[in-house]
Structure formats: C-alpha cells, structure tokens
C-alpha cells in the first residue's frame, strides 16, 4: 500500500512540476523592470525566453517575439534549450509513469517492468527537474550581472547633460514558478525512484529445505507456514498467512482473464 | 461616438473645496487610464492626474498631490478630481482626456472651468 | 520633473509653407523595451480642447492628415507640417508621455502672414 501511495503521490508531484515548468517557459515575465529607486514611468517592460512586452499606464500592452535566433544571447539560448529538454523529459516520464502506475494494469506486465518503468519515469523526472532549475539559475544569474552592470552604468552615466532613464531588470514571476516546479518535479522523481525498490520483486531465492517425513514429500519455506508446491499457484486476492511482515503490495500478483485496464 | 463631458467647476474662495465630475459615454469606460489636465488663463497646459483602467493606481502633479484626489466610479461611468486647500493659481480650465496608446489622450472633454478668488 | 521645451514660441507663416517645429526634453522619452519614444503632439484651436495629432513621436493619430510629421528620439524631436493650410493655424504643444509627473511644452504658435 505504502509503494503505490508513494508511486501515485511521486506522480502527482511531478505531473504539477511539469505543469510548471512548462508555464513558466511559456511566462512573458521571466524579467520585470526594477521599479525601485527609477523615476516612475508610465511604462512598464517585462521579458520572456520568447518575447518582450510593454505595459503603457493606459492599460494598453504590446508584446514583441525575439524573430531571430542568431541575434540572441547565447545564454538566453541556453536557457531555452534546458527549458525545453526539461519538459520533453518531463512529458516522457509522465506517459512511462501512467503505464507504471501500480493502480493500472496493461495486459500481463508484470511488477520487474512496472519497477523498471518507475525507475525509468523517476530518473527522466529528476534530469527534467535538474534542467528546469538550471535554466532558470542561469536566467537569474544573467540578471544579477546585467542589474549591477546597468546600476554601474546608471551612477557613472551623470555627468552628461541628458539624463536617461535607465532601466534595470529584476526577478520576474516565471523565475520563481520555475524554481518551484523544478524542485517538485525533482520530489516527484525521488518519490518514483523510492517506489520502484518497493515495486521490484525480491531477486533472493531460499532454497527450500527438504524434510523427509513419513507421508508426503513436502517442502517448506523458512518464515512462513505456507506449504509450497514449486512455483507461486497462489490466485489473485487469495489472503494467504505470511510469517514475515510483508505488505501485500509485496506478494507478487497474476493477471486473470478478468483484469482489464 | 466617444464623449467627456466635465462639470462642478465654479467660483470658490481660497482655501475652499471642489468636486468636479467627468462623465463618460460611447466606450467600455473601465477598459481605459484617465487623466486630468488644466489650461491656466496664459494657455499653459498643466497635467494634473491620472488614474488606471481599475483604479488602483494614481499619480498625481508633485505641486497637487496633497490637495487633489483622482478617484472613478466603474458603475457611474464617471470619473472625479477632489481638490481642496484650492489658491488662486489652481484658477483654470480642467479638461478630463482618455489615455489611449502611448499614454496620449485621444479624446478630450469640453473643459469645465475653476475660479479661485476672495 | 522632465522639463519640455518648445521652440520657436511663434511662428508666421504663408501658406503652402513648409514649417517645423521643435521639442526638446531634459530626459530621454525613449523606453528601451520597445524602442518607442513616448513624445505626444497636440493641436489647440482657439475656444477648442486639445487634439491629439501624433504620439509614439512618430505615429499619426487615425484621421490626422498625412501632411504632419513627427520624427525624432532621445531629447530631441520634431513636427513638421509639409504644407501649411489655413486651418493649421493654432497651437501645438509637446508632452513627455512617459515618465510622471507628465509635463507639457508651452506651445508654438503657428499664426498665418
């Protein structure tokens, strides 16, 4: 029970975390205009990794695209780039975490693959987690240098007569989105890894020790009382007494011909 | 067609208070910045104030803003300028204007107009 | 404050003239997030509210007719009527758009010879 709570919240987490990440790539303000200690203009400019916009006190806005690719910053580049790997990661582990998920069958999967699918989602979760957060630690640390470089600018600008209103960028709302959803994308991954341990099958095989007892030839496994007959011929939702304190999300089970997804 | 039409100007005394309205008509009146501006009896034009479309922003002339309140009635389709602690140099024509793009006033109203004298 | 000044306080002309005015401000009206100065030109008539011509320093009001320009960036701009008809006759004032508290030029008078 504990492994699919665990699985299912992991997938939860990181299907919000994606769901952010991709908002915040798609957000226009990823830099918003430094209102603090500036002149007040009546307009306001915020930046995105796709275009810029300008918001007139009039309530009028205008968004202009970055129509080129060649003419922009590298870094901005960069930061696009691990946006975009962080959601292609993102949406891949989601539909390999769907066709994981413990509470949904397909066919006759059986619990190795569905572990294995979880490993596979929760990795691609932390990578796209990894990607989000960097990109937008770069985009952050683009604006702390470009901040101090125009307030530098801005102090030693005065001796001319002309002033200029310069305008300094700072932290946008996109930026935090991106910090947090990254970071639940990153949970949300941990949280798969962590339930596909308790998904995978125990790969320990005890050999069975034979007791020749007048009668019948039984083998008996140690920690049970369970009489074993070869393989697992246990049905689907048979209760069956286990000496250990195995969950029964642990006790391999078999599709029937009345499974369906 | 759009239309400002003001009212409330009149003869007051210094250091009386005024309320003058600006009615609007023939546009969404809540989509819109709106402002303020005087002409002095030299024909200077002064800007007194604006407002956003939602109201909650106001900027004000440093030489009025303690004496002169911006404020708009969504419902009323109106907008106001409260001045009080009036002097004889706030004696003008107050026109209210529609901030369109570029923050430019693209319609303008007839003026309504404010006498301050003893 | 920005302080707008406008030159030449009046000006006689004949017409059919070519005439230009001018604006200067003491702060740069041009905004860097989208390259646009945030100049306004107005025309006053006598007994008539103010009439927005040109804002944007260089983009005309629908209905304006295509005989007033505006250009300029930075500081310094300019309106320029190509040809002066009879009923250009009236004042023209600049204002900063951009950063508050807005302010206004004191006008160019533009009277006919």
């Known amino acids: 029970m504990a492994v699919t709570a665990c699985q299912g919240l992991g997938f939860v987490v990181s299907l919000i975390g994606i769901a952010g990440i991709i908002a915040a790539t798609c957000m226009d303000q990823w830099s918003t205009q430094d209102l603090y200690n500036n002149p007040v203009t009546a307009v306001f400019n915020y930046q995105g990794l796709w275009r810029s916009c300008v918001r007139e006190s009039s309530g009028f806005t205008e968004c202009r695209g970055y129509f080129t690719l060649l003419g922009l910053p590298a870094m901005l580049q960069a930061v696009r780039a691990l946006m975009i790997v962080g959601i292609v990661l993102g949406a891949i582990g989601l539909l390999v975490s769907i066709f994981a998920l413990k509470c949904i069958r397909i066919g006759s999967m059986e619990d190795s693959a569905k572990a294995n699918m979880t490993l596979t989602s929760g990795i691609m979760f932390i990578v796209s987690g990894l990607c989000a957060i960097a990109g937008v630690s770069v985009f952050a640390n683009m604006l702390v240098t470009n901040f101090w470089m125009s307030t530098a600018n801005m102090y030693t600008g005065m001796g001319g007569m002309v002033q200029t209103v310069q305008t300094r960028y700072t932290f946008g709302a996109a930026l935090f989105v991106g910090w947090v959803a990254g970071g639940l994308t990153l949970i949300g991954g941990v949280m798969m890894c962590i339930a596909c341990r308790g998904l995978a099958p125990e790969e320990t095989n005890y050999k069975a020790v034979s007791y020749h007892a007048s009668g019948h030839s039984v083998a008996y496994k140690p920690g049970g009382f369970k009489a074993s007959t070869g393989f697992g011929s246990n049905t689907k939702n048979k209760k069956i007494y286990d000496g250990g304190a195995r969950t029964e999300d642990e006790v391999q089970s078999y599709p029937s011909k009345h499974d369906y997804v | 067609q759009v239309q400002l039409k003001e009212s409330g100007g009149g003869l007051v005394k210094p250091g009386g208070s005024l309320k003058l309205s600006c009615a609007a008509s023939?546009?969404?009146?809540?989509?819109?910045?709106m402002s303020w501006v005087r002409q002095t009896p030299e024909k200077r034009l002064e800007w007194v104030a604006a407002i956003h479309s939602n109201g909650g922003s106001t900027y004000n002339s440093d030489t009025m803003r303690d004496r002169f309140t911006i404020s708009r009635d969504h419902a009323k389709n109106t907008l106001y300028l409260q001045m009080s602690s009036l002097r004889s140099e706030d004696t003008a024509l107050y026109y209210c204007?529609?901030?369109?793009?570029?923050?430019?006033?693209?319609?303008w109203g007839q003026g309504t107009s404010v006498t301050v004298s003893s | 404050d920005i302080q707008m000044t406008q030159s030449p306080s009046s000006l006689t002309v004949t017409a059919g003239e070519k005439v230009t005015l001018t604006c200067k401000s003491s702060?740069?009206?041009?905004?860097?997030?989208?390259?646009?100065?945030?100049l306004t030109w107005y025309q006053q008539k006598p007994g008539q509210p103010p009439k927005l011509l040109i804002y944007w320093a260089s983009t005309r009001e629908s209905g304006v007719p295509d005989r007033f320009t505006g250009s300029g960036s930075g500081t310094f701009f300019t309106l320029t009527i190509s040809s002066v008809q009879a009923e250009d006759l009236a004042v023209y004032f600049c204002?900063?758009?951009?950063?508050?508290?807005?302010?206004f030029g004191a006008g160019t008078q533009l009277e006919l010879k």
């Open positions: 023939g546009f969404t009146f809540s989509s819109y910045a």
């Open positions: 204007g529609r901030q369109s793009f570029g923050n430019a006033l693209d319609y």
């Open positions: 204002q900063n758009d951009y950063v508050y508290p807005f302010t």
């Open positions: 702060q740069s009206l041009l905004n860097s997030g989208n390259q646009k100065n945030y």
